[in-house]
Amino acid sequence: MMTGTIETTGNISAEKGGSIILQCHLSSTTAQVTQVNWEQQDQLLAICNADLGWHISPSFKDRVAPGPGLGLTLQSLTVNDTGEYFCIYHTYPDGTYTGRIFLEVLESSVAEHGARFQIP
């Protein structure tokens, strides 16, 4: 039975040209996290594996940095980076947990972080 929940940074906004940290946190389970995949809509951005460490997709290497922790840092943001991001936690023995973050990249200098929320 899957008892865990994913807490994410929720809906967030950031300035064009700036950077942002995408963070998810798995709680309420003793399951072992074996791997976390980060996806942007239908593109694999990065993977953090418990044994192998980080793999950043080559097409994103210039603008994506691993961490902090199991999170992901997006740099040199453009308006095309606006959209949904998913953290996919592969765990044992529970299985897979998925969290969603919506990022809006703004032209202006007014970019506020949204509230944190949970996805069961």
């Epitope: 694999l44 993977i47 192998l52």
Partner: antibody, heavy 118, light 107 residues
Framework: EVQLLESGGGLVQPGGSLRLSCAAS????????MHWVRQAPGKGLEWVAS????????YYADSVKGRFTISRDNSKNTLYLQMNSLRAEDTAVYYC???????????WGQGTLVTVSS | DIQMTQSPSSLSASVGDRVTITCRAS??????LNWYQQKPGKAPKLLIY???SLQSGVPSRFSGSGSGTDFTLTISSLQPEDFATYYC?????????FGGGTKVEIK
């Protein structure tokens, strides 16, 4: 240099058993998921089974479930496939392959031929 | 199970030609799509992983694109050593499944 070397193939009668081995070298075997993929003569590739780095999870194709068992010995850097109740349709070249991040298969062995025939 | 449909099943081309092979998944697989090359009597060789990432050591004339359900492998200028069979494979979910293969032959 990454190397995967399969062995244990051969001719076996229907209903018989065979154990394939895959000896790995040139990388930290215990950190990688591993897979068995087969190819019947003149046919395409068919995934057979996979096992996580720590043996925590094992997955099988429906066509072999209950008959084949995948296992590994990380102290010996070796992957195994125990094949029971073999059928003519199991005749194929069996490849072991390394599966980093459970997303792609980046290194393959040369394959070992299993022939099931009376 | 996710079905992978490759087309064409075979094609004839000349050295220097631009060759395109397509692969369609029966449901969305994000970018969990890999391409392999296989020559007779040899093991498959990884060319492209995660839809568009070129595997180390693979010539840059090979490229991959697509996401969701539709994917493409392109060989920009076919070389003599490229005549082989090409397979797509999804790793979105188990069972892992392969396309039926595309045999690239000399015209």
């Amino acid at each position: 240099e990454v190397q995967l070397l399969e062995s244990g193939g051969g001719l076996v009668q229907p209903g018989g058993s065979l154990r394939l081995s895959c000896a790995a070298s040139g990388f930290t075997f215990s950190s990688y998921g591993m897979h068995w993929v087969r190819q019947a003569p003149g046919k395409g590739l068919e995934w057979v089974a996979s096992i996580k780095s720590s043996s925590s999870n094992k997955y099988y194709a429906d066509s072999v479930k209950g008959r084949f068992t995948i296992s590994r010995d990380n102290s010996k850097n070796t992957l195994y496939l125990q094949m029971n109740s073999l059928r003519a349709e199991d005749t194929a070249v069996y490849y072991c392959a390394r599966g980093p991040y459970d997303v792609w298969l980046d290194y393959w062995g040369q394959g070992t031929l299993v022939t099931v025939s009376s | 199970d996710i079905q992978m449909t490759q087309s064409p099943s075979s094609l004839s081309a000349s050295v220097g030609d631009r060759v395109t092979i397509t692969c369609r998944a029966s449901q969305s697989i994000s970018s969990y799509l890999n391409w392999y090359q296989q020559k007779p009597g040899k093991a498959p060789k990884l060319l492209i992983y995660a839809a568009s990432s070129l595997q180390s050591g693979v010539p840059s004339r090979f490229s991959g694109s697509g996401s969701g359900t539709d994917f493409t492998l392109t060989i920009s200028s076919l070389q003599p050593e490229d005549f082989a069979t090409y397979y797509c494979q999804q790793s979105y979910s188990t069972p892992l499944t392969f396309g039926g293969g595309t045999k690239v032959e000399i015209k």
